[in-house]
Interface confidence: low
């Protein structure tokens, strides 16, 4: 019960932050114009990855996409390239967790197959979030040496002619949203992989029957000493008795003094 | 690249009138377009500006003496002032801020038109 919750709110928490880098991603308020000592004053303009727009205090607004690829700042390509990667691996992570879903059922699919699935899409998940956080906090940094490149510049002149006004920029909505949905998909991909070790295949639930025999008084358990399938805790597979014998689990190579001959 | 040329300074008596041009050319249509005035020994300060939708802005000592206008069709800006005084004389360069994905505005300037005003 506790994985198929877990398993569901990560997806979920997902979807919301695969949903907001890509809302992030379209938004034109990636930088918004600082308005300090701007002599056109009824000018306000705000820019995206893909657009630049200017908002006037008429209510006049134009967006024009950048019109040139070679002329955009490389870092402004790479940031693009880490967003669009961002939502492609949340997307197939979304389509591969849909049929994960331990709620769902698909034919006979194993349980072994959904916590590879969910394993796989937990991993996209935090590729596709740390590849919005990394986007957006390039981008973030861009603006930040931008900004104080240009309050520098503000009065300082270009060929011997004084400039007299320098518009600066500081950070918009969509590098907030970014932040949130890079973090919200991050989490969300943590969640499946956390959930993914609790997928193991479920045995049937025998009761554990006692058998007397002389001498020894031992519950056996059917399936008590299978062997792990490397999806986590081993919780099914408990030492029933002090034989000797031990699970996988238990059998790790914890360090000894031999270890170190 | 954008290319601004000026053109419609010359000798003026106080009082009189002129009308100068700032022509465009080159790449795109600007979002922002403005006259600038440096006189001699002083620091260039704007005189007037004129956005892409229409709104403009005026330096309070040029209010109701000059007006800003643009024909966004052929590219052009103008400024029409009239009422003309002694300190006005000056040299006046034409602006035009180009909004791109640079995080500031790329900022083109003419080469100046000399406007003096003398009886």
């Known amino acids: 019960m506790a994985v198929t919750a877990c398993q569901g709110l990560g997806f979920v928490v997902s979807l919301i932050g695969i949903a907001g880098i890509i809302a992030a991603t379209c938004m034109d308020q990636w930088s918004t114009q600082d308005l300090y000592n701007n002599p056109v004053t009824a000018v306000f303009n705000y820019q995206g990855l893909w657009r630049s727009c200017v908002r006037e205090s008429s209510g006049f607004t134009e967006c024009r996409g950048y019109f040139t690829l070679l002329g955009l700042p490389a870092m402004l390509q790479a940031v693009r390239a880490l967003m669009i990667v961002g939502i492609v691996l949340g997307a197939i992570g979304l389509l591969v967790s849909i049929f994960a879903l331990k709620c769902i059922r698909i034919g006979s699919m194993e349980d072994s197959a959904k916590a590879n699935m969910t394993l796989t899409s937990g991993i996209m998940f935090i590729v596709s979030g740390l590849c919005a956080i990394a986007g957006v906090s390039v981008f973030a940094n861009m603006l930040v040496t931008n900004f104080w490149m240009s309050t520098a510049n503000m009065y300082t002149g270009m060929g011997g002619m004084v400039q007299t006004v320098q518009t600066r920029y500081t950070f918009g909505a969509a590098l907030f949203v970014g932040w949130v949905a890079g973090g919200l998909t991050l989490i969300g991909g943590v969640m499946m992989c956390i959930a993914c070790r609790g997928l193991a295949p479920e045995e049937t639930n025998y009761k554990a029957v006692s058998y007397h025999a002389s001498g020894h008084s031992v519950a056996y358990k059917p399936g008590g000493f299978k062997a792990s399938t490397g999806f986590g805790s081993n919780t099914k597979n408990k030492k029933i008795y002090d034989g000797g014998a031990r699970t996988e689990d238990e059998v790790q190579s914890y360090p000894s003094k031999h270890d170190y001959v | 690249q954008v290319q601004l040329v000026e053109s419609g300074g010359g000798l003026v008596q106080p009082g009189g009138s002129l009308r100068l041009s700032c022509a465009a050319s080159g790449e795109i249509s600007s979002d922002a377009m403005a006259w600038y005035r440096q006189a001699p020994g002083k620091q260039r300060e704007l005189v007037a500006g004129?956005?892409?939708?229409?709104?403009?802005n005026y330096a309070d000592s040029v209010k109701g003496r000059f007006t800003i206008s643009r024909d966004n069709s052929k590219n052009t800006l103008y400024l029409q002032m009239n009422s003309l005084r002694a300190e006005d004389t000056a040299v006046y360069y034409c602006?035009?801020?180009?909004?791109?994905?640079?995080?500031?505005?790329?900022?083109?300037w003419g080469q100046g038109t000399l406007v003096t005003v003398s009886s």
């Open positions: 602006n035009a801020e180009i909004y791109t994905g640079t995080f500031y505005p790329r900022s083109y």
């Open positions: 004129m956005t892409r939708g229409g709104s403009t």
